[in-house]
């Protein structure tokens, strides 16, 4: 009889443990849902305010045609600049035409004056070819004017009206680029 009672007690305890687990899972699930809800609300608010402002570019970015540009306020080496742009969902500036180059240099003159700005151009160590970050070649008129004598990796930067080259480990400002959002109006 005692054995029977003890077995029932153990079964009850096991049931209780299972219910506690289920409750814990439910609480965790509820917390997760609430958090997801908060994220969704924040995301929706961001989206709605962006839609309301109907700005094709984020705050502090400059628009030209289909592109948005961000001119950094900090210095960094080329690789860190690349990382900083990626964080923003952008890449280092890729200059496609003389018109784009003129817009960039004109804007920089207005904003900051004659400083150095990393762009998404680097020189392949083996072949010596200049390539943009997506692997495409720059058009002939958009090759860095001087060949850097550095034994280290060489990257491209904009200064005044020129595209120049330098050791990628030197510190400069940088320019990020992303696509402008199309207006649905």
């Amino acid at each position: 009889k005692l054995l029977q009672v003890s077995t029932i007690a153990m079964q009850q305890q096991e049931k209780l443990i299972q219910q506690e687990r289920a409750l814990l899972n439910f609480t965790e699930w509820k917390r997760s849902c609430a958090l997801q809800m908060k994220y969704c609300q924040a995301f929706m608010q961001n989206s709605l305010s962006s839609a309301h402002n109907s700005s094709p570019c984020p705050n502090n970015w400059i628009q030209n045609r289909e592109s948005c540009y961000y001119v950094s306020e900090i210095w960094s080496i080329w690789h860190t600049s690349q990382e900083n742009c990626l964080k923003e969902g952008s890449t280092l500036l890729q200059i496609e035409s003389k018109e784009e180059m003129d817009f960039i240099t004109g804007s920089l003159r207005k904003i900051k004056g004659s400083y150095d700005y990393w762009v998404g151009l680097s020189q392949d160590g083996h072949s010596g070819r200049w390539l943009w970050q997506d692997g495409s070649s720059p058009s002939p008129g958009l090759l860095p004017a001087e060949r850097s004598q550095s034994a280290n990796q060489v990257c491209g930067y904009v200064k005044s009206n020129s595209l120049l080259s330098s050791n990628c480990s030197t510190w400069k400002y940088f320019i990020c680029e992303k696509y402008a959002l199309r207006s649905s109006v």
Partner: nanobody, 121 residues
Framework: QVQLQESGGGLVQPGGSLRLSCAAS????????MGWYRQAPGKQRELVAA???????TYADSVKGRFTISRDNAKNTVFLQMDSLKPEDTAVYYC???????????????WGQGTQVTVSS
């Protein structure tokens, strides 16, 4: 939070190909960019390739013309197609997601557990 699950590593001969996959789950709507980094023994982790939420691409000089990054938005998955593999591509490859938390206005990096790629004859 963003969780990342990698697959596709392995042993391959020089000149061979491999395809890495990375599936993202969690706060995927907050992801600004996803990419692949690698770390060879005794070396620093380096960016191999990345793709932004707008589809803009970035490659390391050493892989340009050999590796291709792409994504499947429906499956929240990023792929790295590695062709013409060289012994110097041997490393642990990590998937990375750069995401923005609108609640705390903060940027984060999340990493996968890594997948070994060995190029050897």
């Amino acid at each position: 939070q963003v969780q990342l699950q990698e697959s596709g590593g392995g042993l391959v001969q020089p000149g061979g190909s491999l395809r890495l996959s990375c599936a993202a789950s969690g706060s995927i709507f907050s992801i600004n960019a996803m990419g692949w980094y690698r770390q060879a023994p005794g070396k620093q982790r380096e960016l191999v390739a990345a793709i932004t939420n707008q589809g803009r691409l970035t490659y390391a000089d050493s892989v340009k013309g050999r590796f291709t990054i792409s994504r499947d938005n429906a499956k929240n998955t990023v792929f790295l197609q590695m062709d013409s593999l060289k012994p110097e591509d041997t490393a642990v490859y990590y998937c990375n997601a750069k995401w923005y938390d609108p609640l705390v206005i903060e940027y984060y990096d999340n990493w996968g557990q890594g997948t070994q790629v060995t190029v050897s004859s």
